[in-house]
């Protein structure tokens, strides 16, 4: 039969510049001699010759002199070769293939990888900076493969996704210098962090910056939003109120207005330098520019949608700067339940029923409450599932397993907890006249 | 190091449009604003507008609204400026600078005759 | 357009003595003002930003000073390559606007 050949299972990794093993190993029989064994070491791809042993001898490296077998190990299996210096061009798979009497092959994949370097980030523009201003954030490391992974994040660890570009480019070792850049809007403060994964090593490297724009002396704005959620039906427009007390003499020139979502800092709209820079949020925002003078910065958010909710900062800037957050919280009523009943005929006491009440189409998700005809709970024997569709809208479908009585009506309520609206129905059920005895 | 480089000077005909060209290097070009400034000789600096090269918004002094038309081509971190309908009055030096409130680097400036 | 309005329009110093000039605009500014030096046949340079913070790498004889809308650039110990005209912009308002200048000379 043929010549059992094993190799890890696992690709090999090496870093760039250090020395790898890629091992290989046969069981040699009783009374072998290495005038036996013929091993081949190959490019699996190309069938490159790289390293080989015949009639007795080390035929040496084919691999440009980086290429070392194991003599003392041979006798004992031990085929494994070591390959020196390692470089980015040597990943791939290489086949270690032993001949003696019978012959047998198998590949061992090499993933080569270097660290990157710690990022430097620079911030431009990077003197008088102002809330409301749009700065660039690089964040640059060097000499890494393979090609890293690239994340963003503000001071509370929040992912920043939006407006963010990353190249990578490959020098002649082939090796990687990657090149972050994040354009993001000034808030009062903030950290921006940058961090480098190297998916091979597992390895993060990461770098902050912390930008304070400049305050004016005269103080701060005092920015105004309501403490409770703004609750809008989906589909529906909705304000998010926020005001400031503009001092006398105030013009329009002088207001930077930013709204942003407060976790990921994307822009949603924004008015600076006398005019309004339109909606950033798929078009469905708008200000209300006559009131803007007197104060009224709040934000029109047309025909709602679930993936709206949320928190959004009013930003304002004048001489200098205030915010303030506003939670929006969506709603969508849910419909009158359907109630089903199954088995639906030839009902009687004693019977086990599945009663099953669906509504649909609302958010958040409901509360959904069972009872029977005299109001008494029932809460044994209930499952409810909810499911989101697209749009994120649940419809909710609850079963209740209920034995049957002589008569019995049952309830299903569906709460929506926002809008603190109860959607209800029921089903009255009239069992059979009874049989004495019972038929089985 | 950053530079903005412009050329040294235009000779064009009354009536004539112009393109002037700013070359941006030394620094991330779509990071900052680029703005553009008249000088007449022995006279004071006029802004004429700035444009921001990561999305060409633009801004202008409404005295250059009909005058000026500022572009960017990114690929070669170049910002331009087209003057139309020429008259001697526009004979002037223009700069490049790039920033939003300050001007921290500002190109040599060419130098516009209009003259038949 | 916010009107800037520099004096003098022109004046003469001594090595070593301490020159004044004054930008005034014409509404409130807060503090959002620079002062450039441009000497003969170059290009304008920043020396000053937000009132009183010195561009890297100006000497330090220079300063400024004033919010709202009385401003004022010193030089201190006046040198001969301090020849120059020096002027005000405000970065508070759109459209920007600068004064019309102080021409330096060395006496």
């Known amino acids: 039969g043929a010549l059992e050949v094993q190799v890890p299972e696992d690709p090999v990794v090496a870093l760039v510049g250090t020395d790898a093993t890629l091992c290989c190993s046969f069981s040699p029989e009783p009374g072998f001699s290495l005038a036996q064994l013929n091993l081949i070491w190959q490019l699996t791809d190309t069938k490159q010759l790289v390293h080989s042993f015949a009639e007795g001898q080390d035929q040496g490296s084919a691999y440009a002199n980086r290429t070392a077998l194991f003599p003392d190990l041979l006798a004992q299996g031990n085929a494994s070769l070591r390959l020196q210096r390692v470089r980015v061009a040597d990943e791939g798979s290489f086949t270690c293939f032993v001949s003696i009497r019978d012959f047998g092959s198998a590949a061992v994949s090499l993933q080569v990888a270097a660290p990157y370097s710690k990022p430097s980030m620079t911030l431009e523009p990077n003197k008088d900076l102002r809330p409301g201003d749009t700065v660039t954030i690089t964040c640059s490391s060097y000499q890494g493969y393979p090609e890293a992974e690239v994340f963003w994040q503000d001071g509370q660890g929040v992912p920043l996704t939006g407006n963010v570009t990353t190249s990578q480019m490959a020098n002649e070792q082939g090796l990687f210098d990657v090149h972050s850049i994040l354009r993001v809007v000034l808030g009062a403060n903030g950290t921006y962090s940058c961090l480098v994964r190297n998916p091979v090593l597992q390895q993060d490297a990461h770098s902050s910056v912390t930008i304070t724009p400049q305050r004016s002396p005269t103080g701060a704005v005092e920015v105004q939003v309501p403490e409770d959620p703004v609750v809008a039906l989906v589909g529906t427009d909705a304000t998010l109120r926020c005001s400031f007390s503009p001092e006398p003499g105030f013009s329009l020139a002088q207001l930077n207005l930013i709204w942003q979502l407060t976790d990921t800092k994307q822009l949603v709209h924004s008015f600076t330098e006398g005019r309004d820079q339109g909606s950033a949020y798929a078009n469905r925002t708008a200000l209300f520019p006559d009131l803007l003078a007197q104060g009224n910065a709040s934000l029109r958010l047309q025909r709602v949608r679930v993936a709206d909710e949320g928190s959004f900062t009013c930003f304002v800037s004048i001489r200098d700067f205030g915010s303030a957050a506003v939670s929006l919280q969506v709603a969508a009523p849910y419909s009158k339940p359907s109630m089903t009943l199954e088995p639906n005929k030839d009902l009687r006491p004693g019977d086990t029923v599945t009663i099953t009440c669906s509504s649909y189409r609302g958010y958040p998700e409901a509360e959904v409450f069972w009872q029977d005809g005299q109001g008494v709970p029932l809460t044994g024997n209930v499952t409810t599932s909810q499911m989101a569709n697209e749009q994120g809208l649940f419809d909710v479908h609850s079963v209740l397993r209920v034995v049957l009585g002589a008569n019995g009506t049952y309830s299903c309520l569906v709460r929506n907890p926002v809008l603190q609206q109860d959607a209800h129905g029921s089903v009255t059920i009239t069992g059979q006249p009874m049989t004495f005895p019972p038929e089985a | 190091q950053v530079q903005l480089q412009q050329p040294g000077a235009e000779l064009v005909r009354p009536g004539a449009s112009v393109k002037l060209s700013c070359k941006a290097s030394?620094?991330?070009?779509?990071?900052?604003?680029m703005n553009w400034v008249k000088q007449r000789p022995d006279q004071g600096l006029e802004w004429i507008g700035r444009?921001?090269?990561?999305?060409?918004?633009?801004r202008y002094n409404q005295n250059f609204r009909d005058k000026a038309r500022l572009t960017v081509d990114k690929s070669s971190s170049t910002a331009y400026m087209q003057l139309s309908s020429l008259t001697s009055e526009d004979s002037a030096v223009f700069y490049c600078?790039?920033?939003?409130?300050?001007?921290?680097?500002w190109g040599q400036g060419t130098t516009l005759t209009v003259s038949s | 357009d916010i009107q800037m309005t520099q004096s003098p329009a022109s004046l003469a110093a001594s090595v070593g003595e301490t020159v004044t000039i004054t930008c005034r605009t014409s509404?409130?500014?807060?503090?959002?003002l620079a002062w450039y030096q441009q000497k003969p046949g170059k290009s304008p340079q920043l020396l000053i930003y937000?009132?009183?913070t010195l561009e890297d790498g100006v000497p330090s004889r220079f300063s400024g000073s004033g919010s709202g809308t009385l401003f004022s650039l010193k030089i201190n110990n006046m040198q001969p390559e301090d020849t120059a005209t020096y002027f005000c912009?405000?970065?508070?308002?759109?459209?920007?606007?600068f004064g019309g200048g102080t021409k330096l000379e060395i006496k």
């Open positions: 509404e409130n500014i807060d503090y959002t």
């Open positions: 600078a790039r920033g939003v409130r300050i001007f921290d680097y």
């Open positions: 444009i921001d090269p990561y999305d060409s918004e633009t």
């Open positions: 030394g620094y991330t070009f779509t990071a900052y604003w």
């Open positions: 912009k405000q970065a508070y308002d759109v459209p920007r606007t």
């Open positions: 937000n009132a009183n």
